[in-house]
């Protein structure tokens, strides 16, 4: 058929240090060379349909497919992945390409499937199918590690069913908060599937393997602590386990505890309860609230109640699949050039995240931290004052998020010049974005006081580097001006910048710096 | 739904008294422990008391001897008893059942 455009479509891997933008760009990251994926016509389709040669990728690993369409004149498009619809920005090549790019950050499960891009050009409208799927996904994975009670024991067997076999530790702590940090004295590390001290103040199971480090920490609400002023809140999956430990200490043992899931107490089988005595002989009990396989109606309020302590509650939710809950608008900042300043992103998600801070094709270490009120939030101030768009990325089992920062440094313009034989271009990144002023040195005016207006084009915000915006002004040239040198001039809030620039007949072009 | 009223507060000088009450609907009160809570200008929020559904009560060490807290079931109502006023008790008084909260009253001491 001479109606259709010729199409070659691409998939390009990205190196590991590499990262994106998130679900979709149009200015994918330049990496490995890219890889024909064929895209031949599929036969007995209804429609134009293209189908590209399967794509199938490691766990983790950045990619972009891409598309090329040789077609006169404009197109618009439009991405479909699991009947959700996904922005499309078409850009042009060099070779006046039309050029489409899906860029898929750290590959995982949820990603894998079929990538629809309807494309409409101004000839025809056309399908290319992509299919992706994750490359040996039985072969590797790590689980967060779950409790369960030892048979017959007052212990607890920490699990994760994870290929390879992960090496499981538990992670000990009797001290409070910062000083339970990971590398803390205070912490102790038990390279064991099974716990039998179950007193103390933080316990932690870990399992790690060739994919990482996962975690679970064992709830606990402690009645010797002040009631927080936020409620406790714990997330679990339908079919997940529940365990949640009750702790008090007093100076004898004339006291018990008791759970109650909403002010019902519960059944036998339900729960269990260890005692012992401190050192400085005050008796310390603990009584566990576990649920092997949680469904709906496990939904509620947990009180543990004491006759010698005040009782405290925890709602625990029980959700059929993880979220992560945040706001996903996009932030502008505009900060000084030596103000200190970082970004910060607030949210609430189970199972915990994977998350990466991305700037100018760079993916940066992304911390989380733990707030009271069961958000979490993390911050990222490694920006070191470069002006552009910043991306925070994360995901769990279930959901993903992307959230874009735009970081705009305050200061006076610096300009650029270049000249051909017809025109003069200055261009400037100052913030807040310039304004401009051309001004022609003469015998009449040698300070260059004389304006010029005509023939003068202010371009602002032309070209958008990872979020930078640059400003240009042309001025074309005519007779009036030839051989005179003129003077561009970018001002803003915090100064002025010139070039000037001498406008002789075709050939090398002298600048002059001028601040 | 449920909702929680504080009510009694206001200004009283040093040394005197006050009673709160906290009453309670949409919520079957006797079977909740209920707590108080007071946040003074510019400090967090922290807690001052609780009553238990079977009447035990629990009090922070600030105000452990000065202030009683008690329940009238049938009234579905809580109640903070406040002797030997300080100025620093100065605070919005908030009382809690779960994760529901009152508006809160305002108790000035002035010295």
């Known amino acids: 058929n001479q109606d259709l455009p010729v199409i070659k479509c691409v998939l390009i891997n990205h190196k590991n240090n590499d990262s994106s933008v998130g679900k979709s760009s149009s200015y994918p990251m330049v990496s490995e060379s890219p890889e024909d994926l064929g895209c031949a016509l599929r036969p007995q389709s209804s429609g134009t349909v293209y189908e590209a040669a399967a794509v199938e990728v490691d766990v983790s690993a950045s990619i972009t497919l891409q598309v090329l369409v040789d077609a006169p004149g404009n197109i618009s498009c439009l991405w479909v992945f699991k009947h959700s619809s996904l922005n499309c920005q078409p850009h042009f090549d060099l070779q006046n390409r039309g050029v489409v790019s899906m860029v898929i950050l750290k590959m995982t499960e949820t990603q894998a499937g079929e990538y629809l891009l309807f494309i409409q050009s101004e000839a025809t409208n056309y399908t290319i199918l992509f299919t992706v799927s994750i490359r040996n996904t039985l072969l590797y994975t790590l689980r967060r590690p779950y409790f369960r009670k030892m048979e017959n024991q007052d212990a607890l067997v920490c699990i994760s069913e994870s290929v390879p076999e992960p090496i499981v530790e538990w992670v000990l702590c009797d001290s409070q908060g910062e000083s339970c940090k990971e590398e803390s004295p205070a912490v102790v590390k038990k390279e064991e599937k099974v716990l039998h001290e179950l007193f103390g103040t933080d316990i932690r199971c870990c399992a790690r393997n060739e994919l990482g480090r996962e975690c679970t920490r064992l709830f606990t609400i402690d009645l010797n602590q002040t009631p927080q002023t936020t409620l406790p809140q714990l997330f679990l999956k339908v079919g997940e386990p529940l365990w949640i430990r009750c702790k008090a200490v007093h100076v004898n043992h004339g006291f018990g505890l008791t759970w109650e899931l909403e002010n019902k107490a519960l059944e036998e089988g339900n729960y269990f309860e260890m005692s012992t005595y401190s050192t400085n002989r005050t008796m310390i009990r603990i009584l566990f609230a576990f649920v092997s396989s949680v469904a709906r109606n496990d939904t509620g309020y947990y009180t543990c109640s004491s006759s010698k302590h005040p009782s405290q509650s925890a709602l625990v939710t029980i959700v059929e699949k993880g979220f992560i809950n945040a706001t996903n608008s996009s932030e502008d900042y505009e900060i000084d050039q030596y103000e200190e300043f970082c970004f910060s992103v607030r949210f609430k998600a189970y199972p915990q995240i994977r998350c990466t801070w991305t700037f100018s094709r760079k993916s940066f270490p992304c911390e989380q931290k733990g707030l009271d009120n069961g958000y979490s939030i993390s911050k990222f101030c490694n920006h070191k004052h470069q002006p552009g768009e910043y991306i925070f990325h994360a995901e769990n089992d279930d959901a993903q998020f992307t959230k874009m920062f735009t970081l705009n440094i305050r200061r006076k313009p610096q300009v650029l010049a270049e000249a051909s034989a017809s025109q003069a271009s200055c261009f400037s990144d100052g913030y807040p974005l310039p304004s401009w002023t051309w001004k022609k040195c003469s015998d009449k005016s040698p300070n260059c006081t004389e304006e010029i207006t005509e023939g003068v084009w202010n371009r602002k915000a032309n070209r958008k580097v990872f979020g930078q915006w640059v400003s240009s002004s042309t001025l074309n040239m005519s007779e009036a001006i030839k051989g005179f040198l003129v003077k561009c001039c970018a001002y803003n809030s915090l100064g002025t910048s010139c070039e000037t620039i001498l406008l002789n007949s075709p050939g090398p072009f002298p600048f002059i710096q001028d601040n | 739904q449920v909702q929680l009223q504080e009510s009694g507060g206001g200004l009283v000088q040093a040394g005197g008294s006050l009673r709160l009450s906290c009453a309670a609907s949409g919520v079957t009160f006797s079977i909740n422990y209920i707590d108080w809570y007071r946040q003074a200008p510019g400090k967090q929020r922290e807690w001052v008391a609780q009553i238990t559904r079977d009447s035990n009560s629990f009090y922070a060490d600030s105000v452990k001897g000065r202030f009683a807290i008690s329940r009238d079931n049938a009234k579905n109502t809580v109640y903070l008893q406040m002797n030997s006023l300080k100025p620093e008790d100065t605070a919005v008084y908030y009382c809690?059942?779960?994760?529901?909260w009152g508006q809160g009253t305002q108790v000035t001491v002035s010295s």
């Open positions: 809690r059942v779960l994760s529901y």
